[in-house]
Interface confidence: low
């Protein structure tokens, strides 16, 4: 806590300005003003305080506003935002996905720190919703965002945001999370045609169910071998060799190379070794 | 062989309530999405309800929607439907089936069981 | 909601016919469309599923065809036991929905 001392003369600031870089901390607590610092926090982050002056600042803020921040001064915080406890940003209310962005930005290049998640679960439940431009956002900041969200949250995102999900913000994502995604990515591509489909439900297979790959392999698709890796145990012990052929296309000699590994070992053990020859391959079930 | 076995039918005055259980054998019911779906007398099938693998996601037709509760115990491999509020134009029988996704077509269904709802 | 309408909802035809039931989806479903058969006092069974792929098990004398809004069932060499009620069902997207049905009769 800043002791309470008296602004000396001449040195109360009128404004927000380098100046102020010079202040000591008693001086910043003595001569600055709650109310001017909230109209002028545009400005903070264009002086290069330094960390215990921000501490100041804050301190003058979380005065002026108790209750929590006003969004017109949060779109504003900058680095200041940095100095902020999980506590102080569940009193926020953040509306605006211009203020996510900024406070975003400033964290950029870092891990998720609690702050930042604290802020997103304070934006997405004041929404109601993942909607796509937020997703946009939080997954062109954090790739992995998507797939840090639990089966139940994920629930709450549309089959539009869909859109927004690029093939590398599923990469962590596990079964119980694409089994949730997979059925909306469905539904936002219904109406594209065959190859477009499958260009964009790909990245989704993780969650698709054996009658879905069935239906893709009458489709000519030609399905790599990364992807197949990546299909549900479960819903590919299901298919026929045939099935398999057709849906891999030119792929399927990959099968070969995989043929220790899961969905592929467990799905050789399952099919007749008659079948397997059919392939060329040397499976052996 | 899967089997799926719908029991909890019966009589109920309107207002009443119902819990349908299907008991579900032969398939990993764990790797599966479930659903209802009812068939008045004489009349089409209706789908009523679904629910995710996981049973994190739950879906529901209008006209069910809070008053009806889908959920599903992968331990005992059992699916529930809890009816509430329940209605004369609810009697039908309603079948269980096992889906393959949230949104599917049903290639295994229960053989039903009855539900009437009169005074 | 999508609503399916199947022709004719009733038809009568002798064993070894050839018969065919139409399905049509109010908008487009892309081949996100199943056939089921459902006999007296009995649970319904699947035929078909992708509009066109033939469900494990079933015979095939039945074959569906068709994408987007117009969708048929065909049975090439209608059977005995093939008479029966049947129903088109789409899962494109929610709710899921049903055709009213189609009753083969024989004549």
């Known amino acids: 806590e800043v002791e309470k001392t008296a602004c000396p003369s001449g040195k109360k600031a009128r404004e927000i300005d380098e100046s102020l870089i010079f202040y000591k901390k008693w001086e910043l607590e003595a001569c600055v003003d709650a109310a001017l610092l909230a109209t002028q926090m545009d400005r903070v982050n264009a002086i290069p305080f330094t960390y215990e002056q921000l501490d100041v600042l804050k301190h003058k803020l979380d005065e002026l506003y108790p209750q929590g921040y006003p969004e017109s001064v949060i779109q504003h915080l900058g680095y200041l935002f940095l100095k902020m406890s999980p506590e102080d940003i569940r009193k926020w209310n953040v509306t605006s996905l211009e203020t996510l962005k900024a406070l975003l930005e400033v964290n950029k290049g870092h891990e998720m720190s609690p702050q930042v998640a604290t802020l997103i679960d304070r934006f997405v439940k004041g929404r109601g919703q993942l909607d796509k431009d937020t997703l946009d956002t939080l997954t062109a900041f954090y790739p992995g965002y998507l797939c840090s969200l639990s089966p139940e949250e994920l629930s709450s995102v549309p089959p539009s945001s869909i859109w927004a999900v690029r093939p590398q913000d599923l990469d962590t994502c596990d079964p119980r999370q694409l089994d949730v995604l997979y059925p909306k990515a469905r539904l936002a591509f219904q109406n594209m045609n065959g190859s477009e489909y499958f260009v964009k439900i790909q990245s989704f297979l993780g969650g698709a169910p054996t009658e879905d790959l069935k239906a893709l392999s009458q489709q000519n698709v030609s399905m790599d071998l990364a992807t197949f890796m990546k299909l549900r145990t479960d819903a590919v012990l299901p298919l026929t060799v045939a099935e398999v052929q057709k849906l891999l296309g030119p792929h399927v000699e990959g099968l070969k190379a995989e043929e220790r590994h899961r969905p592929v070992r467990d799905w050789i053990l399952r099919q007749r070794q008659d079948d397997l020859d059919t392939l060329g391959l040397g499976l052996q079930g | 062989e899967v089997q799926l076995l719908e029991s909890g039918g019966g009589l109920v005055q309107p207002g009443g309530s119902l819990r349908l259980s299907c008991a579900a054998s032969?398939?990993?019911?764990?790797?599966?999405?479930m659903t209802w779906v009812r068939q008045a007398p004489g009349k089409g099938l209706e789908w009523v309800s679904g629910?995710?693998?996981?049973?994190?996601?739950?879906y529901y037709a209008d006209v069910v929607k809070g008053r009806f509760t889908i959920s599903r115990d992968n331990s005992k491999n059992t699916l529930y439907l809890q009816m509430n509020s329940l209605r004369a134009e609810d009697t039908a029988v309603y079948y269980c089936?096992?889906?393959?996704?949230?949104?599917?077509?049903?290639?295994?269904w229960g053989q039903g069981t009855l539900v009437t709802v009169s005074s | 909601d999508i609503q399916m309408t199947q022709s004719p909802s009733s038809l009568s035809a002798s064993v070894g016919d050839r018969v065919t039931i139409t399905c049509r989806s109010s908008?487009?479903?892309?081949?996100?469309l199943a056939w089921y058969q459902q006999k007296p006092e009995k649970a319904p069974q699947s035929l078909i599923y992708?509009?066109?792929s033939l469900q494990s098990g079933v015979p095939s004398r039945f074959s569906g065809s068709g994408s987007g809004t117009d969708f048929t069932l065909t049975i090439s060499n209608l059977q005995p036991e093939d008479f029966a009620t049947y129903y088109c069902q789409q899962y494109n997207s929610y709710p899921l929905t049903f055709g009213g049905g189609t009753k083969v009769e024989i004549k």
């Open positions: 992708a509009a066109s």
């Open positions: 032969g398939l990993t019911f764990r790797s599966y999405a």
């Open positions: 629910i995710s693998v996981s049973g994190g996601i739950t």
């Open positions: 908008q487009g479903i892309g081949s996100w």
């Open positions: 089936a096992k889906r393959g996704a949230a949104v599917g077509s049903f290639d295994y």
